[in-house]
Amino acid sequence: SPSPVTPSPTLKELIEELVNITQNQASLCNGSMVWSVNLTAGMYCAALESLINVSDCSAIQRTQRMLKALCSQKPAAGQISSERSRDTKIEVIQLVKNLLTYVRGVYRHGNFR
């Protein structure tokens, strides 16, 4: 029987993973800093564009892959080029928390794609 096509992560799964890695955490990835991004300019690709530069941090690899799968979709929310704030760097955990807050809002309002 033919194998299934790739199922994309759902917004709910992304939220669960973001909750999982931020729970009871004061820091992530040894306090690594990343560029702040405007999540309204396509949240998946915008967040990935910043987080792609983080290496040697197993805690966020699953999040990176989820974002990549969602960003890779055609058409997909967030396929638009993101706006990076090149003068503002924040800790990885802050970006992840910002993403969690934003994604939760999108999920509540049912605007998944």
Partner: antibody, heavy 119, light 107 residues
Framework: EVQLVQSGAEVKKPGASVKVSCKTS????????MYWVRQAPGAGLEWMGY????????SYNQNFKGRVTLTADKSTSTAYMELSSLRAGDIAVYYC????????????WGQGTLVTVSS | DIVMTQTPLSLSVSPGETASISCKAS??????LAWFRQKPGQSPQALIY???NRYPGVPDRFSGSGSGTDFTLRISRVEAEDTGVYYC?????????FGAGTKVELK
């Protein structure tokens, strides 16, 4: 030391299926996904997909049109790649690999498994 | 899918010289570009990730540069052990895609 040991060479008939195994050691199996890449004789590298043993999540290269199935057995720290409806164009060395330092950059590779398709 | 165009397809270099391999992507990769080397009969070996970061054990003669869609791998002071086929890999989007490869040999 991370080690990936693959099963031996296979000879299959056209239309058949093949299942290649990749036994791991030296790291926590569920912490990192397992990637599969193939290389036809004298050709380049082609990414087939990955499986995350932690939750079974997969991503497949759609060029394989649903012929690839990736699975993982947490109890034995072994990953599997099954390719169905084999044809001559599937003759290749199949590699399993993991990415630890950078997401999706495969730095630890198995030795490869040659799959031959012949009637 | 993102298409990776690698040039040249083959390269003959004298020992001690510098070899340069180019990789062009069909769309912006941000920094998600890696380089591998494969020697005959062996599995690929990861050399560089995120454009310019060397893996442990990779000599500093190997350096990566570039941004956006254009990337370069430079091998300075080429040695006999540097021969093999070099591949670039984009890991910005799925499916991950490799360049066709550049065969590096010694003159």
């Amino acid at each position: 030391e991370v080690q990936l040991v693959q099963s031996g060479a296979e000879v299959k008939k056209p239309g058949a299926s093949v299942k290649v195994s990749c036994k791991t050691s030296g790291y926590t199996f569920i912490d990192y996904p397992m990637y599969w890449v193939r290389q036809a004789p004298g050709a380049g590298l082609e990414w087939m997909g990955y499986i995350d043993p932690y939750n079974g999540a997969t991503s497949y290269n759609q060029n394989f049109k649903g012929r690839v199935t990736l699975t993982a057995d947490k109890s034995t720290s072994t990953a599997y790649m099954e390719l169905s409806s084999l044809r001559a164009g599937d003759i290749a060395v199949y590699y399993c690999a993991t990415a630890v330092v950078a997401t999706d950059v495969m730095e630890n590779w198995g030795q490869g498994t040659l799959v031959t398709v012949s009637s | 899918d993102i298409v990776m165009t690698q040039t040249p397809l083959s390269l003959s270099v004298s020992p001690g010289e510098t070899a340069s391999i180019s990789c062009k992507a069909s769309q912006n990769l941000r920094n998600a570009l890696a380089w591998f080397r494969q020697k005959p009969g062996q599995s690929p070996q990861a050399l560089i990730y995120l454009v310019s970061n060397r893996y442990p054990g990779v000599p500093d003669r190997f350096s990566g540069s570039g941004s956006g869609t254009d990337f370069t791998l430079r091998i300075s002071r080429v040695e006999a052990e540097d021969t093999g086929v070099y591949y670039c890999l984009q890991h910005w989007q799925y499916p991950l895609t490799f360049g066709a490869g550049t065969k590096v040999e010694l003159k």
